[in-house]
Interface confidence: low
């Protein structure tokens, strides 16, 4: 493992029909509450169980929503974006960016973590290695006493 992580970015048009509880997902982001460093885009933070988005199955937590019914979501306050979704009507067309993590072959969705964050294995591997070195040093030191 060389620690390198690549990202495969794909875009998709997703058409949702508003259900009894709305579109069935929560969003984060906006110019006043950036979810990703240097990116004021709108991201899906949670897919509600049995909601319209969950039943459709294509929208994923961590996806970036680029537009709603053709209206760009760039440079919007968070609440502006919320209002836009609330008033988008019954049939809603979303332009979505999926960011897939490609790590040594297998492709897995990033999920709900911070899309700009460090993948957890990059933290865990060095921590594990340090722990092993410390344990070995401790055992060796004990044997010398």
């Amino acid at each position: 493992m060389n620690g390198r992580v690549d990202y495969l970015v794909t875009e998709e048009e997703i058409n949702l029909t508003r259900g009894p509880s709305g579109l069935g997902f929560n969003i984060v982001g906006g110019t006043d509450q950036q979810y990703v460093s240097n990116d004021s885009g709108i991201y899906v933070s949670r897919i509600k169980e049995n909601g319209a988005a969950a039943l459709d199955g294509r929208l994923q937590e961590g996806d970036k929503i680029l537009s709603v019914n053709g209206q760009d979501l760039k440079n919007l306050l968070h609440q502006d974006a919320v209002d836009l979704f609330r008033n988008a009507g019954y049939a809603v067309s979303l332009r979505v960016q999926h960011r897939l993590q490609v790590q040594n072959g297998p492709i897995g969705h990033r999920g709900e973590g911070d899309p700009s964050g460090i993948p957890i294995f990059m933290v865990l591997v060095p921590v594990f290695a340090l722990t092993m070195v410390a344990a070995w040093a401790f055992m060796r030191y004990r044997q010398q006493l």
């Epitope: 209206q71 760009d72 760039k74 440079n75 919007l76 306050l77 609440q79 502006d80 209002d83 836009l84």
Partner: nanobody
């Protein structure tokens, strides 16, 4: 003191057009969400259209494609171009200011006195 003054209402035949204007004083409209709400006789206030500080606009479904909201930052004026008017568009139209840059409020302190639009 914040003040909103609407103009441009009137009596028009079905299918006709009107252009409403709202002049704001006391703050720059470009830094807020601004919009229009309307109130028909005996009914509650109804949201019509919003323009955000970013320039993004959105409309209630029944007016989409017929109404266009815009603003003139230099003149600090908000406009609502209303085409293909229908009898159900009859109402008093109020210019409204967003609170914290977002939600439109219909309480007196957040809107103008209104301008009557009658489609008949």
């Amino acid at each position: 003191d914040v003040q909103l003054v609407e103009s441009g209402g009137g009596l028009v035949q079905p299918g006709g057009s009107l252009r409403l204007s709202c002049t704001a004083s006391g703050y720059p409209i470009s830094t807020y969400a601004m919009g229009w709400v309307r109130q028909a006789p005996g009914k509650g206030p109804e949201w019509v259209a919003t323009i955000y500080y970013s320039g993004v606009t959105h409309y209630r479904n029944s007016v989409k494609g017929r109404f266009t909201i815009s603003r003139d930052n230099a003149k600090n004026t908000l406009h609502l171009q209303m085409n293909s008017l229908k009898p159900e568009d009859t109402a008093v139209y109020y210019c409204a200011k967003g609170v914290n840059g977002t939600y439109l409020r219909v309480e007196a302190e957040y809107r103008g006195q209104g301008t009557q639009v009658t489609v008949s």
